[in-house]
């Protein structure tokens, strides 16, 4: 029959591509920290700005009580940078001679909390040594990777010493995630 020569021999069904603008995403920025109690075996979690300046949460991604809440299951890119600053940090041997309050390392951990699992999971961890004699120091630690996350998962950023976090600029210390 006429016209049949143009008919495809098989039909392919394509799922409509999801617009990037519809996907959950958030970028949180540093804010002044308030001293809070934290668990004995866990570094304190940072509090974040979710709405002012460069910060935002979109498409059901929510921030509450130091946690970024994952609204749907999928593969997410999760990232954080924490910039630390401090006064001169003496090296280990000097520290051992009676200055135990000076850190010789700084650590950032991105942690996942799942309600159905009792223990928080460390997703990413970064550590740097700070041993700069004779100067004040600044050290950024950047972490970022892709993870398969489930709806209801909660993400937070923990640091070894909240008092050393540089909260003066929103482009120095930040935390975010977006659905790929």
């Amino acid at each position: 029959l006429k016209g049949q020569e143009f008919a495809p021999s098989h039909q392919q069904v394509y799922a409509p591509l999801r617009a990037d603008g519809d996907k959950p995403r958030a970028h949180l920025t540093v804010v002044r920290q308030t001293p809070t109690q934290h668990l004995k075996n866990q570094f304190p979690a940072l509090h974040w700005e979710h709405e002012l300046g460069l910060a935002f949460t979109k498409n059901r991604m929510n921030y509450t009580n130091k946690f970024l809440l994952i609204p749907e299951s999928g593969d997410y890119f999760v990232y954080s940078q924490v910039t630390f600053r401090g006064m001169t940090s003496e090296c280990s041997e000097i520290r051992q001679a009676g200055r135990p309050n000076k850190p010789d390392s700084i650590t950032v951990v991105i942690t996942k909390v799942t309600d159905s699992y009792p223990e928080p999971t460390q997703l990413l961890m970064g550590t740097k040594s700070v041993c700069e004699v004779g100067s004040n120091w600044f050290q950024p630690i950047y972490l970022g990777a892709m993870f398969s996350l489930q709806e209801g998962d909660k993400l937070m950023v923990n640091v070894s010493d909240i008092s050393l976090v540089d909260y003066t600029k929103e482009d120095k210390t930040f935390f975010g995630a977006f659905l790929l």
Partner: antibody, heavy 118, light 107 residues
Amino acid sequence: QVQLQESGPGLVKPSETLSLTCTVSGGSISSYFWSWIRQPPGKCLEWIGYIYYSGQTKYNPSLKSRVTISIDTSKNQFSLKLSSVTAADTAVYYCARETGSYYGFDYWGQGTLVTVSS
Amino acid sequence: DIQMTQSPSSLSASVGDRVTITCRASQSINNYLNWYQQRPGKAPKLLIYAASSLQSGVPSRFSGSGSGTDFTLTISSLQPEDFATYYCQQSYSTPRTFGCGTKLEIK
């Protein structure tokens, strides 16, 4: 101790532009969010908008078409311009500081009354 | 915009009384709720931030509670200097919005 001080004319004619400046002393204007808030006589407080030290602004949609907030970090000042004013814009205008969403407006200027009248 | 509703709009009480003021948000604001005190002719003063955190320098007789949409400010024992107007304010989203105030008067 951080202090905020509003300055500008107390009387503005209808259809003209209201201009106010807030001078910040005792601390840096950097790393904070700086807002303008107004209170018509005997009425509720109304947030006008904020500016960040980087120059980023966000305005109340109800006033957005008439508002401009700017900042001069070298002078530790930020300013408000409200165009096409009417009698409804008569209010005490406050400048205020916000450290972040979590912390509220922790420092305020003493306020300046601006009357719109011919 | 998030609407903030305060009640009561005015309240008479005596020195030493325990007083509670309530504030309701038109949608959940988690704990992004602040309380201010304003005396006549003065600027508002921050009392409580993040629903329950006492601002530095504020007497401990002031306390706040609540989360989501319903919040309260409590003054445990009224002092003469507490007679003023109190405002709640949400800082969950912009535009920032305030309640219209509760005027606390001497009985």
